[in-house]
């Protein structure tokens, strides 16, 4: 089989602003906000996939909802859609029992917790259309969470929820190159709660990372390290109990 694929090909992207496996409803977020040109797909979740995705079928290995992935998760269809109401997520900050996960424990995870800090290998590097899903529970009285996409000694993307920075809750994103941190990007929307379960999804796009928490879009971070394919691990640290960390291509 001929394989003329290059990194340039990978970075050309699919052009689908709302791929299957990525949260499709954004609560009160206006259409097109958060770097989604042209609005989201009406009625995309549940029951309808956006054009060009996987109608009526979970993409292979999608998480959760793929057959066998989590007991009680609906399949086919990747995410069953948020509860009705003014927001995209229940006010408690936890998924309802009728959502993607069963009510029996945090996200119905299949196996014991992972040791934090945790390094998730990315043995082929980071590529566009890679969807990374991290499930866990914030510890009581948590101070911080950190995700670090590492390229050698550099940190291509540092995602750092801080629970008490000068009595404020804030998410700080940054990049570290040659041992120097760059300009911080700060986000005051803070979807994490001490003691509560969470789901973080990071979708790699050709020119940015998209981050969603608990099925709601949170932020995007433009690539400062362009050689995505040289990022070889994702460090997960902080005040969390980590249930799982995995990825799929969508």
């Amino acid at each position: 089989m001929a394989d003329n694929f290059s990194l340039h090909d990978a970075l050309s992207g699919s052009g689908n602003p709302n791929p299957q496996g990525w949260p499709g409803a954004w609560g009160n977020q206006p259409a097109g906000a958060g770097g989604y040109p042209g609005a989201s797909y009406p009625g995309a979740y549940p029951g309808q996939a956006p054009p060009g995705a996987y109608p009526g079928q979970a993409p292979p290995g999608a998480y959760p909802g793929a057959p066998g992935a989590y007991p009680g998760a609906p399949a086919p269809g990747v995410y069953p859609g948020p509860p009705s109401g003014p927001g995209a997520y229940p006010s408690s900050g936890q998924p309802s029992a009728t959502g993607a996960y069963p009510a029996t424990g945090p996200y119905g995870a299949p196996a014991g917790p992972l040791i934090v800090p945790y390094n998730l290998p990315l043995p082929g590097g980071v590529v566009p259309r890679m969807l990374i899903t991290i499930l866990g529970t914030v510890k009581p009285n948590a101070n911080r969470i950190a995700l670090d996409f590492q390229r050698g000694n550099d940190v291509a993307f540092h995602f750092n929820p801080r629970f008490n920075e000068n009595n404020r809750r804030v998410i700080v994103c940054n990049t570290k190159l040659d041992n120097n941190w760059g300009r911080e990007e700060r986000q005051s929307v803070f979807p994490f709660e001490s003691g509560k379960p969470f789901k973080i999804q990071v979708l790699v796009e050709p020119d940015h990372f998209k981050v969603a928490v608990n099925d709601a879009h949170l932020l995007q971070y433009n690539h400062r390290v362009k050689k995505l394919n040289e990022i070889s691990k994702l460090g997960i640290s902080g005040d969390i109990d980590l249930t799982s960390a995995s990825y799929t291509m969508i």
Partner: antibody, heavy 119, light 107 residues
Framework: QVQLQQPGAELVKPGASVKLSCKAS????????MHWVKQRPGQGLEWIGM????????DYNEKFKNKATLNVDKSSSTAYIQLSSLTSEDSAVYYC????????????WGQGTTLTVSS | DIVMTQSQKFMSTSVGERVSITCKAS??????VAWYQQKAGQSLELLIY???NRHTGVPDRFTGSGSGTDFTLTITNVQSEDMTNYFC?????????FGAGTKLELK
Amino acid sequence: QVQLQQPGAELVKPGASVKLSCKASGYTFTSYWMHWVKQRPGQGLEWIGMIHPNSGSTDYNEKFKNKATLNVDKSSSTAYIQLSSLTSEDSAVYYCTRWGIYYYARDYWGQGTTLTVSS
Amino acid sequence: DIVMTQSQKFMSTSVGERVSITCKASQNVGTNVAWYQQKAGQSLELLIYGASNRHTGVPDRFTGSGSGTDFTLTITNVQSEDMTNYFCEQYSNFPLTFGAGTKLELK
């Protein structure tokens, strides 16, 4: 057509070092991580480490950090593994494997080099 | 290190039958598991990645399933050329680790 070409066999003496090669063709060498895997009869498969040909960035299995050194020659699209202070425990088949991008796993393997360490 | 246990070193089957090869991880590896086939005297070939995704060109009689700690490679309508070695690998944690292999034999 993707190919990873490895010499069939190497015979070296205990205490010596050896450098095994893996010549890649049929794809953009600098766009994919190259991994090395050791297979001993009855011992299964062991991951040694990985290298990105563009940057030379490496990750090693701790077990092999003092045994193996990975490098590449971009001009010839060749990956190398150097094994030092050889003993009979290092006698094995060594595979270079490409980690895929579309197919996120070891999508291509070399034929392997059989290394025999013997006096 | 994560240990990938393929509890059956050998499995006997017949042409046309269905067989399931199992692999158990010592801790949660999500869906970060691949399956490879190794024919005698040859290198390995990718069958399944991401626990359940069939590699291009792999016959659809090969199916992967599982997540967390328990994984299965199922071969339906086994063919004579399938009588060979199968290895699982986890890539959820460094170091990446393989199962010891399962050899499919003719009953």
